[in-house]
Structure formats: structure tokens, C-alpha cells
Interface confidence: low
């Protein structure tokens, strides 16, 4: 009790004249504080009942107080409706009138708020977004609602938070609470695991071509999780891309074009919340030479009785570094001419008259000859021969 007793000794005379010493105890009560003063800074916690959709206000006091008209049990005021004010008159025998009039400003219903993961899937490997959403209307003044988040040692007083530059595949715990007029009325905790990150870059060990139509690439896989590889190879403007099994560390490229530069790119990817591609490792090689294809549209035309004009079109596939056209002229099985030009345009003069010739034109790319295009053509008899005859009489 706040009242306290003081003991004092007094001497009085009795009627007989003898002195009698008696001890009396006098209670002196210093003034009690008013309940209004005593409970001026009382704090309240609100507890929500999801079944009844009503709140209980828990009064943070050390003694069991009385609540006037509102009954309170164990310092709890029950059955409070959301967003409605309730007035509670708080008294106790340790304080005097006037009582503390406490206005309970009841918060909105807890289920009207939902903690929502607002992380963009594209960025879910390194960011977390959390946001309180109002999913139903209420009549409370939204100005009086404040939000608080704590993620690790970071504290935010926002309705929405965005954490950036996080580690992929890591768990982060965030606690959050909502306060109404600075009274906490709901909280939530979320453990969020960031998404798989982009895989690292594969390490190409070698990438080469040792034949005209084949190449090979070998690599070490990246360290981080991934599902598959994509291998692309580009020749000139044509790009081929192939999905490869994650367990492969080597791929043989077939059906390549001879003497052609191929640029290869290899990246790993993972299909997580979205597909994430790792950085591509690049390399290139040039395939070996091969025989060129045949020249085409070859023509042999006579320019005189014993002269020919041989022409042809370039091969479709040169397949090598250089460009040279060859013409072989045979009579019977005897090679009578062997010419080489930059262009397929040959003028063959001074052949034998009235003779069958075989003309073989082919392309040489510096490494290989192509298949010859073969035409047969005969020279004429010498139409000018009669001018040279002398008649003797």
C-alpha cells in the first residue's frame, strides 16, 4: 500500500496522578496520486480473434485494475469491434479520482492485411520485395497505420520494402508488424529463398577443327547450378544453336563447311522462376580445306578452224584459300595443252585441224583440285588450205 504508519511515544497523566506511559500508533496517509496521473502513459496491445473477428485490448499495467462500465478481466478488455472507439474508465485502490479515461482506438481487422511477395521473377535471384496489401476495406483512418520491417539488422518503416544485391540461393528472414496509432496489432514473418542465379561462364578447354567438315569443342562446366547448355555456332550470317545435356563436356560438330570460319558460343542456362542464361564463352576455328566443287556451265566454241574459246562458271564451293582455273586439252591420250588462269576464260589457238580434242576444266583452291568438267570438241579441216595449192600445167 502507498499509505504508511509512523509510531510515536506520548506521556499523559492519569486521574490518580500517577504517570502512565502509553504507546499509540497514529496512521498518517500521504496524498495518493490520481488514477488519471498514475495511468497517464498506459500502453495497450491488441489481440485479434479470427473466429469472432473481435479484438481484446491488453492493458500493460502491473496491478489488476477496474474498468468502470466495461468489464475487464485480468487487465483485458474483450469484444472490441474493429475501427470503433471504446472508452474505458481505469481505477484502482492505489489512486484517487479522477479515473483515467482511456480511449481505445480499435485497429482494423487483421485479416484485412496480407503480406505479399512482390518480387519480380526476373530479379528474384538477387532481390526481395515484400509489401503489405489491404485486401478488404475498413473505416479506420489509414493515416494512423504504420508499417515496420526488420530483415536481418536492417529496419524499414515502409509499407513496401525492396532488398537488392542479395546472394542467389540464400534464405533471408524478414519480420514485419503493423501498428495502429503506434499500437502493434498484427505481425508476420517470412523466410524467402532467393532464386537460382545465372550460371557462371563455362571454361572452354579447346575448340578446333582438324578436318574439312568437323570441329570439336571441350569445356569445363560452370560452378553454379544449371540445367543445360546452349551451343551456338555462327558462320557468316547463319547461326545454329543446339541445346546440350548438362553432363556433356565435349561436342563434335559435324557437317561443317570446309575452309570456313566458325565462331562458337557456349552458355549454361537454368530454368528457375524464369530462364536465366549464364555468360557465354566464345571461341572460333577455321575448318580445313577440301576439294572444290565442279566448275559449271562450261562451253567450248570455235573461233577459227583450229582455235577454241573455253569458258566456265566458278564452282559453288571453293573450299580453300586460292582461286585458279586449269584447262587441260588432250588429243587421244596425249596432253597437248595445260593452261592456268585467274578466270575461267581460255583461248586455245593453233590446234591440229580435223582433230578430236578433250577439254577438261577444273578449279584449284591452292590445296585441292576439283572434279574436272569434260567436253569433247573437234577442230575443222583447214578451210583456207585451197588458197595455198599451186596448180602446175
Amino acid at each position: 500500500s502507498d499509505a504508511y504508519l509512523n509510531a510515536s511515544e506520548t506521556t499523559t497523566l492519569s486521574p490518580s496522578g500517577s504517570a502512565v506511559i502509553s504507546t499509540t500508533t497514529i496512521a498518517t496517509t500521504p496524498s495518493k496520486p490520481t488514477c488519471d496521473e498514475k495511468y497517464a502513459n498506459i500502453t495497450v496491445d491488441y489481440l485479434y480473434n479470427k473466429e469472432t473477428k473481435l479484438f481484446t485490448a491488453k492493458l500493460n499495467v502491473n496491478e489488476n485494475v477496474e474498468c468502470g462500465n466495461n468489464t475487464c478481466t485480468n487487465n483485458e478488455v474483450h469484444n472490441l469491434t474493429e475501427c470503433k472507439n471504446a472508452s474505458v474508465s481505469i481505477s484502482h485502490n492505489s489512486c484517487t479520482a479522477p479515473d483515467k479515461t482511456l480511449i481505445l482506438d480499435v485497429p482494423p481487422g487483421v485479416e484485412k492485411f496480407q503480406l505479399h511477395d512482390c518480387t519480380q521473377v526476373e530479379k528474384a535471384d538477387t532481390t526481395i520485395c515484400l509489401k503489405w496489401k489491404n485486401i478488404e476495406t475498413f473505416t479506420c483512418d489509414t493515416q494512423n497505420i504504420t508499417y515496420r520491417f526488420q530483415c536481418g539488422n536492417m529496419i524499414f518503416d515502409n509499407k513496401e520494402i525492396k532488398l537488392e544485391n542479395l546472394e542467389p540461393e540464400h534464405e533471408y528472414k524478414c519480420d514485419s508488424e503493423i501498428l495502429y496509432n503506434n499500437h502493434k496489432f498484427t505481425n508476420a514473418s517470412k523466410i524467402i529463398k532467393t532464386d537460382f542465379g545465372s550460371p557462371g561462364e563455362p571454361q572452354i578447354i579447346f575448340c578446333r577443327s582438324e578436318a574439312a567438315h568437323q570441329g570439336v569443342i571441350t569445356w569445363n562446366p560452370p560452378q553454379r547450378s544449371f540445367h543445360n547448355f546452349t551451343l551456338c555456332y555462327i558462320k557468316e550470317t547463319e547461326k545454329d544453336c543446339l541445346n546440350l545435356d548438362k553432363n556433356l563436356i565435349k561436342y563434335d560438330l559435324q557437317n561443317l563447311k570446309p575452309y570456313t570460319k566458325y565462331v562458337l558460343s557456349l552458355h549454361a542456362y537454368i530454368i528457375a522462376k524464369v530462364q536465366r542464361n549464364g555468360s557465354a564463352a566464345m571461341c572460333h576455328f577455321t575448318t580445313k580445306s577440301a576439294p572444290p566443287s565442279q566448275v559449271w556451265n562450261m562451253t567450248v566454241s570455235m573461233t577459227s578452224d583450229n582455235s577454241m574459246h573455253v569458258k566456265c562458271r566458278p564452282p559453288r564451293d571453293r573450299n580453300g584459300p586460292h582461286e585458279r582455273y586449269h584447262l587441260e586439252v588432250e588429243a587421244g591420250n596425249t596432253l597437248v595443252r595445260n593452261e592456268s588462269h585467274k578466270n575461267c576464260d581460255f583461248r586455245v589457238k593453233d590446234l591440229q585441224y580435223s582433230t578430236d580434242y578433250t577439254f577438261k576444266a577444273y578449279f584449284h583452291n591452292g590445296d585441292y583440285p576439283g572434279e574436272p568438267f569434260i567436253l569433247h570438241h573437234s577442230t575443222s579441216y583447214n578451210s583456207k588450205a585451197h588458197h595455198h595449192h599451186h596448180h602446175h600445167h
Epitope: 546452349t230 547463319e238 547461326k239 545454329d240 544453336c241 543446339l242 541445346n243 546440350l244 557437317n255 563447311k257
Partner: nanobody, 127 residues
């Protein structure tokens, strides 16, 4: 495992048209290149047409050039072959196939580059 179901074949007069469809089930083929091949009785299998994963690139064999059109609908997991100005030499069993290739040039003309094959649909062109 992917199952490919080709349909739309039948008997048609020379000069007529047909549209073949190939529906994939078992898994999505939206990231795969798709192709059509054909095999006439007693002949080698022949490349007809191919299309890359998103339809941006198409490839045609010599026989199909200018007359046939390949297309795809990734939402339906289906690839189509529209065949116009049909000739008797187009008579064959037409097969659709799915490749691991996402895009492809020369690679898509090679049957060996295709992983999954349909059961084929017969096209008969009468003169």
C-alpha cells in the same frame, strides 16, 4: 518423352492443296526446331521443310521451294505444312520431327539432327 502425331494427309488431285499438322504431346516443343521429311516408296528419306523455335527462320528443300509453307503455333504445340500446287511426285509418307536445335541452317536439313519422329501421314497426289 515427346510424341508427335502427324495428320492431314489424304488423296488429292494434281494442282490441289493439303495442310498437314503435327501435334506434340509429352512435353513442350516450343524451344525446339521442327521439320517435315518425306519418303516415297523405294526412295531415300528427303528433307522438305524446317522451322526454327520461334518461327523466325524457315528452311525448304529443293522440292518444296515456292510451293510449300511451314509454320508453327507454339501455344498449341503444333507445326503445319501447307502444300500447294501438288504434283504426282509429291506422293509420299510425310513425317514430322523435333530437333534439339533451337535454330539451324544446314543442320536442320539433316534427318540425323532430329531426336523425335512422328508416325507419318500418307499424301497421294493423283494425276
Amino acid at each position: 518423352q515427346v510424341q508427335l502425331q502427324a495428320s492431314g494427309g489424304g488423296l488429292v488431285q494434281a494442282g490441289g492443296s493439303l495442310r498437314l499438322s503435327c501435334a506434340a504431346s509429352g512435353r513442350t516443343v516450343s524451344s525446339d526446331a521442327m521439320g517435315w521429311f518425306r519418303q516415297a516408296p523405294g526412295k531415300e528419306r528427303e528433307f522438305v521443310a524446317a522451322i526454327n523455335w520461334n518461327g523466325a527462320s524457315t528452311y525448304y528443300g529443293d522440292s518444296a521451294q515456292g510451293r510449300f509453307t511451314i509454320s508453327r503455333d507454339n501455344a498449341k504445340n503444333t507445326v503445319y505444312l501447307q502444300m500447294n500446287s501438288l504434283k504426282s511426285e509429291d506422293t509420299a509418307v510425310y513425317y514430322c520431327a523435333a530437333s534439339d536445335w533451337v535454330v539451324g541452317g544446314i543442320s536442320l536439313m539433316n534427318g540425323a539432327e532430329y531426336k523425335y519422329w512422328g508416325q507419318g501421314t500418307l499424301v497421294t497426289v493423283s494425276s
